[in-house]
């Protein structure tokens, strides 16, 4: 099976089996070299090992045939070439992976059979509830998760001067409950804000490929003013 063996003269002893090493056909490889046993009756018996078509090739009619453009095979252990996953392509023969379309990405940890994905769109319908120097934010998930399940949220806090119209990072005095980044739920509480101060909170949706994208951040902004402490 995808292996060839040399013509072999049988041994004289009728009980004797001669072990013969074979070789893998073109574009095939093996983990365990193929061997067969030649009996005194001239029969091949007891095969050991096997050959597999290498990555980029599939078995058809006893030979290894190239994967055509649009198809790939990542490993010899996969039986046949498969279509490129969504949002990817290959224009090569013998492809072992597919290329992501423009604005789509694949993490190194994503398997080659997984669709290429993109960063999520912005969260939606953000609302705020101010209680003295605490703010509770709530939102709903993005309409487009980018094709990934690993969506989380990051909260950027900016303190704004209403007269000058200038905003600056809030700094370390603000506490986020449960946390500022890697939020899995769609709400967060900010405490220890300054009284009578204008704040802008940017709620950004991120996923596993957000850091691979050069595109603009996708966030929704909420403006709030804190009350008396």
């Amino acid at each position: 099976h995808l292996a060839v063996f040399p013509d072999t003269i049988t041994g004289a002893d009728s009980s004797q089996l001669l072990e013969v090493s074979g070789s893998c056909v073109n574009h095939s490889v093996t983990d365990e070299p193929p061997k067969m046993h030649c009996s005194a009756e001239g029969e091949w018996l007891v095969p050991i090992g096997k050959c597999m078509c290498k990555a980029g090739y599939e078995e058809k009619n006893g030979t290894c045939q190239v994967c055509r453009p649009g198809f790939f095979k990542a490993s010899p252990h996969i039986q046949s070439c498969g279509k490129c996953p969504p949002h990817s392509y290959t224009h090569e023969e013998a492809s072992t992976s597919c290329v992501c379309e423009k604005d789509y990405f694949r993490r190194e940890s994503d398997p080659p059979t997984m669709a290429c994905t993109r960063p999520p769109s912005a969260p939606r319908n953000a609302i705020s509830n101010v209680n003295e120097t605490s703010v509770f934010l709530e939102w709903i998930p993005p309409a487009d998760t980018g094709g990934r399940k690993d969506v989380s949220y990051y909260i950027a806090c900016k303190k704004c001067n209403s007269h000058a119209g200038v905003c600056e990072e809030c700094g370390g005095h603000v506490r986020y409950l449960p946390r500022q980044s890697g939020l899995k739920n769609t709400s967060v509480m900010m405490v220890d804000l300054l009284a009578h101060t204008n704040y802008t909170f940017e709620i950004e949706a991120v996923n596993g490929v957000s850091d691979l994208s050069p595109g603009a951040r996708q966030y929704v902004s909420v403006n709030v003013t804190t009350n008396q402490a």
Epitope: R68, P69, G70, C84, Y89, H91, E92, V99, E101
Partner: antibody
């Protein structure tokens, strides 16, 4: 914006040679297969040749096999068609066209074409 | 080589009416459940434009009055409501195997 711009066409005598270029911009050139397609005056489209992004896959039409060579320089984002032993029947507008990314792929962007005239 | 034959060679259709162009391949252009058939539109002095890929998939930016159907060896391009700008030559092309042959073209005129 995806752009393909052909150049290098002109008048050449039968038996002569010409090298066409196709300058690409607006996409990751090295990952795209590109085709040459030609159109004789007043006639239909004829597919000529194809080269994949890594130059590992190359196909030719029977009518040009052995005379034309398709190649590319990914560092210059440029595709080439070296045409030797030219014949009168090679007279045509030559287009380069990009293979698309939506499967099964069509030729989704085309250049404006360059005219090659083979005549004595 | 796969030979692509279009019919008719030319047709004239009134504005707002339906136009149908057929393409027949000398052998199947299907592979693994997909039809490797594309349709292009070409206007005088211009480069061709991809309309339909994979027999029935509308290329981005193409009006939905264009549609494609068929599999195996027989394919159809349909323009459901003809507009003045649809006057052009239409080509089918198979990309199932090299060489990627085109049909001879069908000239569509507006009556």
């Amino acid at each position: 914006e995806v752009q393909l711009v052909e150049s290098g066409g002109g008048l050449v005598q039968p038996g002569g040679s010409l090298k066409l270029s196709c300058a690409a911009s607006g996409f990751t050139f090295s990952t795209f297969g590109i085709h040459w397609v030609r159109q004789a005056p007043g006639k239909g489209l004829e597919w000529v040749a194809y080269i994949s992004g890594a130059s590992t896959t190359i196909y030719y039409a029977d009518s040009v096999k052995g005379r034309f060579t398709i190649s590319r320089d990914n560092s210059k984002n440029t595709l080439y068609l070296q045409m030797n032993s030219l014949r009168a029947e090679d007279t045509a507008v030559y287009y380069c066209a990009r293979y698309g990314t939506s499967f099964p792929y069509g030729l989704d962007y085309w250049g404006q074409g360059t005219l090659v005239t083979v005549s004595s | 080589d796969i030979v692509m034959t279009q019919s008719p060679d030319s047709l004239a259709v009134s504005l707002g009416e339906r136009a149908t162009i057929n393409c027949k391949a000398s052998q199947s252009v299907d592979y693994d459940g997909d039809s490797y058939m594309n349709w292009y539109q070409q206007k005088p002095g211009k480069a061709p434009k991809l309309l339909i890929y994979g027999a029935s998939n509308l290329e981005s930016g193409i009006p939905d009055r264009f549609s494609g159907s068929g599999s195996g060896t027989d394919f159809t391009l349909t323009i459901s409501r003809l507009e003045p700008e649809d006057a052009a030559v239409y080509y089918c092309q198979q990309s199932n195997e090299d060489p990627f042959t085109f049909g001879q073209g069908t000239k569509l005129e507006i009556k």
